[in-house]
Amino acid sequence: NADGLKEPLSFHVTWIASFYNHSWKQNLVSGWLSDLQTHTWDSNSSTIVFLCPWSRGNFSNEEWKELETLFRIRTIRSFEGIRRYAHELQFEYPFEIQVTGGCELHSGKVSGSFLQLAYQGSDFVSFQNNSWLPYPVAGNMAKHFCKVLNQNQHENDITHNLLSDTCPRFILGLLDAGKAHLQRQVKPEAWLSHGPSPGPGHLQLVCHVSGFYPKPVWVMWMRGEQEQQGTQRGDILPSADGTWYLRATLEVAAGEAADLSCRVKHSSLEGQDIVLYWEHHSSVG
């Protein structure tokens, strides 16, 4: 994918609200282009913080101001509403509400939108077409919550428009504005190390790959041209500079490490794979 983000592309906003007791609460709001955080919400000033120079996409200042106002009102409204109905809904303090909403793009076309609310980490209600529906497993509490949420039809209409119209328009503008950043190619660095000993007479070999962008990468321990199926890939982890880090490990008998190598394939290397040989690896550190 030319823009360095895996299909389907998504933009979503997450709202995590913690209710400690009737009067003490806090919230975290963030905006994400796939797995890249692009926005955050400053609760003190009730403003959207743009984390990348291109995070405004092609929206005007006026549009951003209106969205800020809407988010501010809805945040206040949500807090007040949840606090008001907490007892009726049998929400027991302390509890957490998580909301995620956004849209997906497939081959440049909108493939869908979503808005889901979870209570204590479990699916509770979701927004479908133009109204809130309970998850069947969530029971009567969720049904009652939907009844409350669906009282304001105009609010639901605007929510529907934000998901089906504003969000897809925003993604396209964001991709265009961030093209240079999202299409960049950053070469990985790789190095080898010992992992914690898995047992007597065995070694854990670790191949570290860091500083690469975009995210898709292939890392494998090899013996000659043969891939070692025992290779364990960790999660691809984000670095503070927007690049990625990955480690791949392999457990072997001490005498079988000599002709092993770690091979790294990445789009930035243009076919020139990085190959590091364990026998050349310095055991210092």
Epitope: H154, I158, S164, T166
Partner: antibody, heavy 116, light 107 residues
Framework: QVQLQQSGAELARPGASVKMSCKAS????????MHWVKQRPRQGLEWIGY????????SYNENFKDKATLTADKSSNTAYMHLSSLTSEDSAVYYC?????????WGQGTSVTVSS | DIQMTQSPSSLSASLGGKVTITCQAS??????IAWYQFKPGKGPRLLIH???TLQPAIPSRFSGSGSGREYSFSISNLEPEDIATYYC?????????FGGGTKLEIK
Amino acid sequence: QVQLQQSGAELARPGASVKMSCKASGYAFSTYTMHWVKQRPRQGLEWIGYINPNSASTSYNENFKDKATLTADKSSNTAYMHLSSLTSEDSAVYYCARGFYTMDYWGQGTSVTVSS
Amino acid sequence: DIQMTQSPSSLSASLGGKVTITCQASQDINKYIAWYQFKPGKGPRLLIHYTSTLQPAIPSRFSGSGSGREYSFSISNLEPEDIATYYCLHYDNLPWTFGGGTKLEIK
């Protein structure tokens, strides 16, 4: 900047119908709703209803369900209100207004006079 | 439907002075109230929404407060251009309804 340009004044006979327009500019038409409000001299303001241009769904005040029909054309960023079976009670100024968190921007109004 | 009772229906005040208008809803409207300024021959103007949030470019002489069923709107340091009719609107659920209006005159 946001602008709502309404069509000109209408003079109609009792029993006739009129269709007025509201052309929107300066914003993304499909993100917002379009509302209509009636103002009669010494009668105050009445909310007629709204259309969501994105989904074409409508919500009406019960008092106007059989009187007003709201439509929208996304290709021309224009909302319309059709008033049928006109009587002298329908003589008023009709405003269109953009809806988001509430009705924030309004048109200049279309005056309708029903007279025989 | 929710009824909005606005008072007074008219008032007269001096330049530089302060006026307050109230709206009482027939039931709790959860702070979903807006205030508008109507002037003859001009499109209406939204001044305040969600009880106390000022629209961009509206001077801070305008303010709003309230909760539940009782809401108020004030203009301080009155200026000649404030001569207008002011309306409250509730938009908590459908149908939205307006107050009867308050005509403001300058002494």
